[in-house]
Amino acid sequence: LNTTILTPNGNEDTTADFFLTTMPTDSLSVSTLPLPEVQCFVFNVEYMNCTWNSSSEPQPTNLTLHYWYKNSDNDKVQKCSHYLFSEEITSGCQLQKKEIHLYQTFVVQLQDPREPRRQATQMLKLQNLVIPWAPENLTLHKLSESQLELNWNNRFLNHCLEHLVQYRTDWDHSWTEQSVDYRHKFSLPSVDGQKRYTFRVRSRFNPLCGSAQHWSEWSHPIHWGSNTSKENPFLFALEA
């Protein structure tokens, strides 16, 4: 079973150039190959995937994952109950909504069961790892002869999200973009009726409820302009 693992752009670095871990001289630990890093994302606060690069292991190893929440009622160590697999080797763990506590420090421990002292423990702030679903139900309304308003919906608490709107005409080579706060509406004050416009939106869990860096996927685009405006300038349907 192959699992598709989300690896968002802009957060990767290939400069992890060490192989042996050296400890201070008073330590009893021996040099060991480091375990892969665990990367977690909380999808719309519906489920969370914590994944690692299983192919970084020198030989195929079913690493195990445990987790708990620091200083909370949920501080009991939990075993992963739903592993994700890549070529029949564990490569992640999926946690369901009831196991996600956004505002408590999440502690995740990866371990080599064949060598229990080979373990790595990370701490994560889940509120910075939320990725919302893409905005839906984009609609356009003509406010005046030259002004358009774009509206959309999110399947989440609206006040927690900020948005990025991109638009362009069929004459443009690049997108124009505009940041929008939690109000999830955008007005374009000057529209050229001779051009066809395309709009799309993405959302991010920032800044009121968390400090996530990652955006949702882009919404399906919606179009307005020359070929549709002649028919009914006050009614515009979503075009996927």
Partner: nanobody, 126 residues
Framework: QVQLVESGGGLVQAGDSLRLSCVAS????????MGWFRKAPGKEREYVAI???????FYEDSVEGRFTFSRDNAKNTVYLQMNSLRPEDTAVYYC????????????????????WGQGTQVTVSS
């Protein structure tokens, strides 16, 4: 090879402050998870403060609210500001670095760190 050098330790009275510094040479710390650890006589090494290169910072329970981790990437240096020191803070303090791929990786396990300083002694008298 990375070299980490700590400084700023010393003998102080309970309630006083100290600021530890850790300067790196050999590579930039800008893409490293960083940690301050301490080892008191007869005790296991424990993390004091850990930080991802994305800026998420975590503290050991007993130092939360008293200690502050910070970093200055331009100077390739990390700091540990220690206020309201207590006798139980007496230990050798170590700085550690781990190059990481992800901005959110912050390790509390000491064996996850590739590079260590030689340590600086902090003694708090009552």
């Amino acid at each position: 090879q990375v070299q980490l050098v700590e400084s700023g330790g010393g003998l102080v009275q309970a309630g006083d402050s100290l600021r530890l510094s850790c300067v790196a040479s050999g590579r930039t710390l800008s893409r490293c998870a960083m940690g301050w650890f301490r080892k008191a006589p007869g005790k296991e090494r424990e993390y004091v403060a850990i930080s991802s290169w994305g800026g998420d910072t975590f503290y050991e329970d007993s130092v939360e609210g008293r200690f502050t981790f910070s970093r200055d990437n331009a100077k390739n240096t990390v700091y540990l500001q220690m206020n309201s020191l207590r006798p139980e803070d007496t230990a050798v303090y170590y700085c550690a670095a781990a190059p990481t791929s992800f901005a959110t990786t912050a390790y509390s396990s000491s064996n996850s760190y590739a590079y260590w300083g030689q340590g600086t002694q902090v003694t708090v008298s009552s």
